[in-house]
């Protein structure tokens, strides 16, 4: 008799999930020699232990603590780039500006980037059919709790000037419900962080508006100021030129506004 299985509204665990996590861990330690003390088998075991045999709507940050401990990593606290709804450009930027880091440039972020996973209560099986959707099912699901945990820790570690890349093409340039708006903003430490500098990325070729005056940016400024952190904002009118100028700062066309 086929066993009844809970049907969730979200996509199931990414295929080859265990193999992918393990392979990513090994790759990461290969290209980041300072992390070669990490035992990737233990990392996978801790990752698995956070959600296997647990109800996928009942996951806590505590479940991920063994993994957090194994993945402890020191990144320069003054070189942190946060992002919201513009992941690809943020990653292209840190790929060129090698001394800056997004969460996905750290081991734990790299391991889980773009993956989905969940288990089932009281069975050691991984659910490849469906996983809980944050809105339709529950917020305390394995994926959401993971990102909340690592994002909080990442923001807590930041110091001096913290940069955030925001998508100027969206109706809410700053969204209070995003991971940045709901987790990272509230976990920057005022005693360590002097300034949050927002980079608003323009989408249209001819878009010359000052998106730093957008109401949602003003809302972000208000939240940050109330936390005793200074706020500054820059328009990035031409993201393609911006990246090119990061690559080749001495280019004569890079002195003008980008």
């Amino acid at each position: 008799v086929p066993r009844w299985r809970q049907q969730w509204s979200g996509p199931g665990t990414t295929k080859r999930f265990p193999e992918t996590v393990l392979a990513r861990c090994v790759k990461y330690t290969e290209i980041h020699p300072e992390m070669r003390h990490v035992d990737c088998q233990s990392v996978w075991d801790a990752f698995k232990g956070a959600f296997i045999s647990k109800h996928p709507c009942n996951i806590t940050e505590e479940d991920y603590q063994p993994l957090m401990k194994l993945g402890t990593q020191t990144v320069p606290c003054n070189k942190i780039l946060l992002w919201s709804r513009i992941k690809d450009l943020a990653h292209q930027f840190t790929q060129v500006q090698r001394d800056m880091f997004t969460l996905e440039d750290t081991l734990l972020g790299y391991l889980a980037d773009d993956l989905t996973w969940c288990g089932e209560f009281n069975t050691s099986k991984i659910n490849y059919q469906s996983c809980p959707d944050w809105r339709k099912d529950c917020s305390n699901n394995p994926v959401s709790v993971f990102w909340k945990t690592v994002s909080r820790r990442f923001a807590e570690a930041a110091c001096d000037v913290v940069h955030v890349m925001l998508n100027g093409s969206r109706s809410k340039i700053f969204d209070k419900n995003s991971t940045f708006g709901s987790v990272e903003v509230h976990n920057l430490q005022p005693e360590k962080v002097q300034t949050l500098e927002a980079w608003v990325i323009h989408g249209g070729r001819e878009d010359s508006r000052d998106l730093c005056q957008d109401p949602t940016i003003k809302e972000l400024e208000s939240i940050i100021s109330k936390r005793n952190i200074q706020f500054s904002c820059k328009n990035i009118y031409r993201p393609d030129k911006f990246l090119q100028c990061v690559k080749n700062p001495e280019d004569s066309s890079c002195t003008s506004e980008i």
Epitope: R16, E19, T20, L22, A23, R24, C25, V26, K27, T29, E30, I31, P33, R36, H37, D39, C40, Q41, W44, H91, Q95, D113
Partner: antibody, heavy 123, light 112 residues
Framework: QMQLVQSGAEVKKTGSSVKVSCKAS????????MHWVRQAPGQALEWMGW????????DYAQKFQDRVTITRDRSMSTAYMELSSLRSEDTAMYYC????????????????WGQGTLVTVSS | DIVMTQTPLSLSVTPGQPASISCQSS???????????LNWYLQKPGQPPQLLIY???TRAAGVPDRFSGSGSGTDFTLKISRVEAEDVGVYYC?????????FGQGTKLEIK
């Protein structure tokens, strides 16, 4: 079985570019970093850079930073190394290579190599 | 960059006799994980290099046990207990402790 098969020999003019391919088979292409190493005639081996085939992220040796571009086509399980502004000193055998995994640890040695692609640069 | 220096640059050995190649690194290759990131390769004429030894002393799959690697943080040795005709070629040491990985200039082994 695991194989890295490279494109054929090339003869190029000074100042032009060359693009060498490396087709992987017998393993999951995105699971391993791909490295490129070159060897000029009678010279030692020289590491050029790596690509993570899953994300497309790269890192290059300082010496080649301005002239080399490593890319990949995931659907073809193929990595590419393009070298621009060729000079006579770039005449060399170009290899793609990857490590072996020893019980979930990268060995740190290039255990698998392509057969090599000879690039000759002439004026 | 870490500089790798090999000695001798060439070596002529009678079959059945032992051979020894030295390699020195400009910095210690011992990682905090306890592994020493020093590799040895043999490149036979017209072929790509083949990995012989990794982590200073671990033989790669399929490598005969007449090959052995030893050393400390900066001084390393590849020993062949009894040289065979098929061992001819150029031997390279390589560090993979940090990027860029760097190779020694090579030691050419010939049969007398």
């Amino acid at each position: 079985q695991m194989q890295l098969v490279q494109s054929g020999a090339e003869v190029k003019k000074t100042g032009s570019s060359v693009k060498v391919s490396c087709k992987a088979s017998g393993y999951t292409f995105t699971d391993y970093i791909m490295h490129w190493v070159r060897q000029a005639p009678g010279q030692a081996l020289e590491w050029m850079g790596w690509i993570d085939p899953e994300y497309g992220s790269t890192d290059y040796a300082q010496k080649f930073q301005d002239r080399v571009t490593i890319t990949r086509d995931r659907s073809m399980s193929t990595a590419y190394m393009e070298l621009s502004s060729l000079r006579s000193e770039d005449t060399a055998m170009y290899y793609c290579a990857r490590v072996a995994i020893i019980t979930t640890v990268a060995s740190g040695g290039f255990a698998y190599w392509g057969q090599g692609t000879l690039v000759t640069v002439s004026s | 960059d870490i500089v790798m220096t090999q000695t001798p640059l060439s070596l002529s050995v009678t079959p059945g006799q032992p051979a020894s190649i030295s390699c020195q690194s400009s910095e210690s290759l011992l990682h905090s994980n306890g592994k020493t990131y020093l590799n040895w390769y043999l490149q036979k004429p017209g072929q790509p290099p083949q990995l012989l030894i990794y982590w200073m002393s671990t033989r790669a799959a399929g490598v005969p046990d007449r090959f052995s690697g030893s050393g400390s943080g900066t001084d390393f040795t590849l020993k062949i207990s009894r040289v065979e005709a098929e061992d001819v070629g150029v031997y390279y040491c390589q560090q993979f402790l940090e990027y860029p990985p760097t190779f020694g200039q090579g030691t050419k082994l010939e049969i007398k």
